[in-house]
């Protein structure tokens, strides 16, 4: 549909750069304008199939967004249409043209919605919220959304661009992309991961000067792992026939652990099966009413010689399994008395 009688059509064109992407062309439109961006090769040479993207995300044609091979039209522009537009070669994804689009008729410093005056005088950029600029290190739990802000002003209204570790930072540089919101002077990254760690710099500039701010992002990760069992537990035990014994197993796990106590047994005189897997019997496992704390203790009452042998605490979660084993030695009561007489000590667990 053609622009209505109230709308202005504002055209911006850019020459296709060489192999090195050129600087973004800074362009401004009024609210309600029809934005028209053109990307033409020098001398009319064909560029091949192209796609248009905004803030690193491919643009889909709609009733308001008209996408052509070398031309993009956005009808009835609003502030949400501000951003970085690029025309890319469809196959190689080489950036052919770069536009940084502002839509005016909004507070020139974006985050100055509190109505404070911004400078009308011509001048270099400055921070409008300097009290927010001193937190340089942000430690963010993985999977959260992080937002860097650099609210600024100047006349003419400055442009803002972002660097990661000193290099130009664009949406295609991270899985999930980024959201560049020029009216808010902000960079948003959703669902951060460890690879997002680094130094992020906003560069705010106009023809009178440039200011920059660097934030360091650390992503706090709790790496998923199989359960960790406390060293030395369960411990080997020596017990007197008929006494009670407790084995302890301390389990650490982020994911919900499943704990079992196993006793190694012999089948036809063999301790292991044909595949080398030990023969075991399950003594204790999670039930409807058992707590993790209860499962961390295996109690044996009135032990017999048959109870002697190897016991294993097995803990598993969604990541994997861990196990620790200990031995129980059962001594006859007479031996206990003899040892007491000779050495003055008792072999008791």
């Amino acid at each position: 549909e053609p622009p209505g009688p109230e709308q202005r059509v504002v055209r911006r064109a850019a020459e296709v750069p060489g192999p090195e992407p050129s600087q973004q062309e800074q362009v401004a439109f009024g609210s309600g304008d029809t934005v028209e961006l053109s990307c033409h090769p020098p001398g009319g040479a064909p560029t091949g199939p192209t796609v248009w993207a905004k803030d690193g995300t491919g643009l889909v044609a709609s009733h308001r967004i008209l996408v052509g091979p070398q031309r993009l039209q956005v009808l009835n522009a609003s502030h949400e249409d501000a951003g970085v537009y690029s025309c890319q070669h469809r196959l190689t994804r080489r950036v052919l043209c770069h536009f940084s689009v502002r839509v005016t008729d909004a507070p020139s410093s974006g985050d100055d919605e509190d109505g404070e005056d911004v400078a009308e005088d011509t001048g270099a950029p400055y921070w409008t919220r300097p009290e927010r600029m001193d937190k340089k290190l942000l430690a963010v739990p993985a999977a959260n959304t992080v937002r860097f802000r650099c609210p600024a002003a100047g006349n003419p209204t400055p442009s803002i661009s972002w660097l990661k570790n000193g290099k130009e930072f664009r949406g295609e540089h991270r899985i999930g992309g980024i959201k560049l919101r020029h009216q808010q002077w902000s960079l948003v990254m959703e669902s951060v991961v460890p690879s997002d760690r680094g130094n992020y710099t906003c560069v705010v500039e106009n023809k009178f000067g440039s200011i920059r701010q660097t934030y360091t992002l650390d992503v706090l990760e709790r790496s998923p792992h199989r359960p960790i069992l406390q060293a030395g537990l369960p411990a080997n035990q020596t017990a007197i026939l008929g006494s009670d014994v407790e084995f302890h197993c301390k389990v650490y796990s982020d994911a919900q652990p499943h704990i079992q106590w196993l006793k190694h047994v012999e089948v036809n005189g063999s301790k292991v099966g044909p595949d080398g897997t030990p023969y075991v019997t399950v003594l204790k496992t999670a039930g409807a009413n058992t707590t993790d704390k209860e499962l961390e203790v295996l109690s044996l009452h009135n032990v017999t010689f048959e109870d002697a042998g190897e016991y294993t605490c097995l803990a598993g979660n969604s990541i994997g399994f861990s196990h620790h084993s200990a031995w129980l030695v059962v001594l006859p009561a007479e031996e206990e008395l003899m040892e007491t007489d000779e050495a003055g000590s008792v072999y008791a667990g």
Epitope: D114, R129, E131, K135, R147, E190
Partner: antibody, heavy 119, light 107 residues
Framework: EVQLQQSGPELVKPGASVKMSCKAS????????MHWVKQSHGKSLQWIGY????????NYNQNFKDKATLTVNKSSTTAYMELRSLTSEDSAVYYC????????????WGQGTSVTVSS | DIQMTQSPSSLSASLGGKVTITCKAS??????IAWYQHKPGKGPRLLIH???TLQPGIPSRFSGSGSGRDYSFSISNLEPEDIATYFC?????????FGGGTKLEIK
């Protein structure tokens, strides 16, 4: 554990001033902006402003610029809000809340200080 | 300022049931919305931030969704301790604004 402990209820006369406190513990006080929010009876919450405890910088809602003054004492990890020229319209519960540094939401709140303005 | 219109202002539901509360912003808030539970005499408790991210320690019975100007918050499998007032907060810009609150009662 992050905790924000606010001072007790206040009964003040019209025209007077009141200064309430918000004692922070369980985190590095100077690392997070502290916000103040007003809850009048039967009305939705209103944002008053925030202070950066590290540099003392403030940002006020225009509607409260002449009403509230935000300050901090770094050594006691306490934020303060003073309200002046009180009227019955200022009767409300006032909350302090910590701003999460990486996105701007308010993640921990005090239990509130009730202010009643009455002659 | 961005206005946040929250509805309903009150609702009653049965234990084990599900309730949904909505907040509509006067302009696009780019998913920067948080939801809080508020009980008398206590400070509000953050449940969800950035539209749908659950705070650590908050049960998955609580959920949020939305984009642009329209956002919703739900509690499923209602429990007695869910009786409270719930409100939304937009923090898209540097002028924080709140919804009017929804008082939840159990039938």
């Amino acid at each position: 554990e992050v905790q924000l402990q606010q001072s007790g209820p206040e009964l003040v006369k019209p025209g007077a001033s009141v200064k309430m406190s918000c004692k922070a513990s369980g985190y590095t006080f100077t690392d997070y902006n502290m916000h103040w929010v007003k809850q009048s009876h039967g009305k939705s919450l209103q944002w008053i402003g925030y202070i950066n405890p590290n540099n003392g910088g403030t940002n006020y809602n225009q509607n409260f610029k002449d009403k509230a003054t935000l300050t901090v004492n770094k050594s006691s990890t306490t934020a303060y809000m003073e309200l002046r020229s009180l009227t019955s319209e200022d009767s409300a519960v006032y909350y302090c809340a910590r701003e999460r540094d990486y996105d701007g939401s308010m993640d921990f709140w005090g239990q509130g200080t009730s202010v009643t303005v009455s002659s | 300022d961005i206005q946040m219109t929250q509805s309903p202002s009150s609702l009653s539901a049965s234990l084990g049931g599900k309730v949904t509360i909505t907040c509509k912003a006067s302009q696009d808030i780019n998913k920067f919305i948080a939801w809080y539970q508020h009980k008398p005499g206590k400070g509000p408790r953050l449940l969800i931030h950035y539209t749908s991210t659950l705070q650590p320690g908050i049960p998955s019975r609580f959920s949020g969704s939305g984009s642009g100007r329209d956002y919703s918050f739900s509690i499923s499998n209602l429990e007695p301790e869910d009786i409270a007032t719930y409100f939304c907060l937009q923090y898209d810009n540097l002028l924080w604004t709140f919804g009017g609150g929804t008082k939840l009662e159990i039938k």
